[in-house]
Amino acid sequence: LPAQVAFTPYAPEPGSTCRLREYYDQTAQMCCSKCSPGQHAKVFCTKTSDTVCDSCEDSTYTQLWNWVPECLSCGSRCSSDQVETQACTREQNRICTCRPGWYCALSKQEGCRLCAPLRKCRPGFGVARPGTETSDVVCKPCAPGTFSNTTSSTDICRPHQICNVVAIPGNASMDAVCTSTSPTRSMAPGAVHLPQPVSTRSQHTQPTPEPSTAPSTSFLLPMGPSPPAEGSTGD
């Protein structure tokens, strides 16, 4: 004969565990129902009554089956340098990612605490390493024979055009100027761009367990004067 299906709450057999989507309540010493994502335990179970679940209150969530007394608080609204890629719902936290042209300067357990603008390499410097969603652009001085005349977070150093007759020699921030009508070799017109990083990584705020008692923390980090990286500009 098949084993009889027990309905929550029930006392587990000695040495056995509660089933999927159930938990063992120490006070009642019974296996009781968990609450589904988007809910929390409003009333804990007893020996004779099962867990009473309730929907998460506004701006709070639970992502997993649970028996927490309060849903977790969603993270703060995304700041102006971020994009909300996932809204706060009863079942998921808000997810904010850095806007294009920004990167995550201060990450945390999951996601980003602080976005910062990607460094722009000034004329005479080109991008040595492009920015990613978690790292800044690295600039390098243009080597002899190359130049960059832009202030950009994507442009690399480009070779000077080679002239039959040089009118003005090129330098790190300017291309060579030729006197003859057509140079022997030149790069295609226009700056060479590196692709912008695309932010895809989840960056959501660490939840606080009890929105009704725990004030949210705002992360105000000192952004005072700091020496600019070589070849970079704050513009």
């Epitope: 506004d58 701006s59 809204a87 706060c88 929105p211 004030p215 949210s216």
Partner: antibody, heavy 120, light 108 residues
Framework: EVQLQESGPEIVKPGASVKLSCTAS????????MHWVKQRPEQGLEWIGR????????KHDPKFQDKATLSSDTSSNTAYLQFSSLTSEDTAVYYC?????????????WGQGTTVTVSS | DIQMTQSPAIMSASLGERVTMTCTAS???????LHWYQQKPGSSPKLWIY???NLPSGVPARFSGSGSGTSYSLTISSMEAEDAATYYC?????????FGGGTKLEIK
């Protein structure tokens, strides 16, 4: 364009009931709350209660629990506030207001208000 | 219930003057759950500052908000004629959600 359109002014007798409506248009987010707020002449704002139109769940300020009934009709995107056993204290402008889930209760859109006058 | 007390109840300021009004909660309120509304006579309230310090689009940058715990404030860096209105703070931290009594700002 997002709009909350409230029903017209009401003049009612003491002891009677009144049902106000608030029709929402232009919202693309279904996960919202509709709130009702009372403002007596020359006075401040008082939160009456709110309804989650998707589930019909309501929450009231206890002082309005027996006075106010909140309901909604999702097919017409309309929220209702029924006020019963009216007295002169209920003479006020009643506003409906919208807050999206996840915005910590910030009421970002308000109706134009419905004036209710209780007079014999 | 969390009581919200606004002060002053009425204030007047000259054009160009810096203005600060305060809102004190009877118990701690999370900064995410503290909002300000502006209301002019004959009009509906408008969300003016949300989650303590954030300005909705259309609100001039001369407005700012700050605070934590039980003490919050709204500041206008340089008063303009169109800022004359009543400002209400509102807590959504714990039900029943409550408004302050308002601060009426007039032009001197």
């Amino acid at each position: 364009e997002v709009q909350l359109q409230e029903s017209g002014p009401e003049i009612v007798k003491p002891g009677a009931s009144v049902k106000l409506s608030c029709t929402a248009s232009g919202f693309n987010n279904k996960d919202i709350y509709m709130h009702w707020v009372k403002q007596r002449p020359e006075q401040g704002l008082e939160w009456i209660g709110r309804i989650d139109p998707a589930t019909g769940n309501t929450k009231h300020d206890p002082k309005f629990q027996d006075k106010a009934t909140l309901s909604s009709d999702t097919s017409s995107n309309t929220a209702y506030l029924q006020f019963s056993s009216l007295t002169s204290e209920d003479t006020a402008v009643y506003y409906c207001a919208h807050s999206p889930y996840g915005d910590f209760g910030a009421m970002d859109y308000w109706g134009q208000g419905t004036t209710v006058t209780v007079s014999s | 219930d969390i009581q919200m007390t606004q002060s002053p109840a009425i204030m007047s300021a000259s054009l160009g003057e810096r203005v600060t009004m305060t809102c004190t909660a009877s118990s701690s309120v999370s900064s995410n759950y503290l909002h300000w509304y502006q209301q002019k006579p004959g009009s509906s309230p408008k969300l003016w500052i949300y989650s303590t310090s954030n300005l909705p689009s259309g609100v001039p940058a001369r407005f700012s908000g700050s605070g934590s715990g039980t003490s919050y404030s709204l500041t206008i860096s340089s008063m303009e004629a169109e800022d004359a209105a009543t400002y209400y703070c509102h807590q959504y931290h714990r039900s029943p959600w409550t408004f302050g009594g308002g601060t009426k700002l007039e032009i001197k």
